[in-house]
């Protein structure tokens, strides 16, 4: 039994780090392997992660950790019974994948504006709480070409867009993801998407003026 692709890990900079690796053949990860991890200089015993299968030869382990400190460095030991298959280290602050934002809601009660809001996935005392920026993806279920990304570079987890920028009378979906420049993180996973019907109608005067203007062209 050998490791084909060495473990690579990402941290949510809160309480979980996820490590993935591949073995050289089909493996029952949970019964055959253990991933031991320990904070460097920690005097208490190393923690044990029981991996799960991730495809035939792939394994994934979710390491439970305490609040991350930027200097934290963990030793990782991958064991198959009494055999040490791989030894490495992992610094969570250098491999951050933020948690996905949640509770994405589209507020359509203002006729000419769409307000999208979502929740910051971190508690206020976590360092990433004030350092996330977001990307909002809006797309039409009817038209695959109607696909747009809005970059939200301010801290407030919301986005306002004019309803008129979207086609009227059709359904749209939106989702949001996050990243943090301070730790040069990867993007989070996308949030679950939310759906709404864009029923925006131009006021008669605007519509009439717009139609008249168009006619002159």
């Amino acid at each position: 039994m050998k490791v084909l692709q060495e473990p690579t890990c990402v941290s949510d900079y809160m309480s979980i780090s996820t490590c993935e690796w591949k073995m050289n053949g089909p493996t029952n990860c949970s019964t055959e392997l253990r991933l031991l991890y320990q904070l460097v200089f920690l005097l208490s015993e190393a923690h044990t992660c029981i991996p799960e299968n991730n495809g035939g030869a792939g394994c994934v382990c979710h390491l439970l950790m305490d609040d991350v400190v930027s200097a934290d460095n963990y030793t990782l030991d991958l064991w198959a019974g009494q055999q040490l298959l791989w030894k490495g280290s992992f610094k969570p602050s250098e491999h951050v994948k933020p948690r996905a934002p949640g509770n994405l809601t589209v507020h359509t009660n203002v006729s000419d504006t769409l307000l999208l809001t979502w929740s910051n996935p971190y508690p206020p005392d976590n360092y990433l709480y004030n350092h996330l920026t977001y990307a909002v993806n809006i797309w039409s279920e009817n038209d695959p070409a109607d696909f747009r990304i809005y970059n939200v570079t301010y801290l407030e987890p919301s986005l306002r867009i004019a309803a008129s920028t979207l086609k009227s009378g059709i359904s749209y979906r939106a989702r949001v993801r996050a990243w943090a420049q301070c730790y040069n993180t990867t993007w989070s996973e996308w949030s679950p998407s939310t759906k709404w019907h864009n029923s925006y109608r131009e006021p008669f005067e605007q519509h009439h003026h717009h139609h008249h203007h168009h006619h002159h062209h």
């Epitope: 904070l39 920690l42 005097l43 208490s44 015993e45 609040d67 400190v69 200097a71 005392d125």
Partner: antibody, heavy 119, light 108 residues
Framework: EVQLVESGGGLVQPGGSLRLSCAAS????????MSWVRQAPGKGLVLVAT????????SYPDSVKGRFTISRDNAKNTLYLQMNSLRAEDTAVYYC????????????WGQGTLVTVSS | DIQMTQSPSSLSASVGDRVTITCRTS??????LAWYQQKPGKAPKFLVY???TLAEGVPSRFSGSGSGTDFTLTISSLQPEDFATYYC??????????FGQGTKVEIK
Amino acid sequence: EVQLVESGGGLVQPGGSLRLSCAASGFTFSTYGMSWVRQAPGKGLVLVATINSNGGSTSYPDSVKGRFTISRDNAKNTLYLQMNSLRAEDTAVYYCARFFRFRNAMDYWGQGTLVTVSS
Amino acid sequence: DIQMTQSPSSLSASVGDRVTITCRTSENIYSYLAWYQQKPGKAPKFLVYNAKTLAEGVPSRFSGSGSGTDFTLTISSLQPEDFATYYCQHYYGPPTWTFGQGTKVEIK
């Protein structure tokens, strides 16, 4: 309930020896790092010895290095501090403490045992 | 070794007061800092770790903050049972970890 109970303190002459014990219960002793911390009368806290969960790694400040030895018997759930060549300045209450599972902060402490070094 | 400087060494306050104790370190310890409370004749009690995370069962009137070299323990509304001596301790790097000299919180 986590409990740490120190014993072995008492009056000893300068140059003498003493062995402190700390009986642990209410947790899996063999998985936790442990320490001895002392507090001279009216003074602050000073870490005097640490040991990791399996006993393979120990550490001491210069003030006690070569005179004090920390050890543990995981089968007996007991921590020890062997103190040799004792000096008057070693007079203190000695606490045993458990290191927190994820950090080297001490989350549980014993009630302490008084060591008095005097002629 | 890293030096720990706590201030003030003592303070007098009344029940309901907001109390702030500071701890300064001689070098960057990131957030590797704990706070303890000790009452006369008793063992220290674990309050805060990682500079800001409350230990289990610690009342929310306690809070920790800071990183690097400057740290603070705050009691938002002092209660009768909070009169005690408070110590900071760093646990950065190899186990030569040191405590601050303590801050005694007394009744005014």
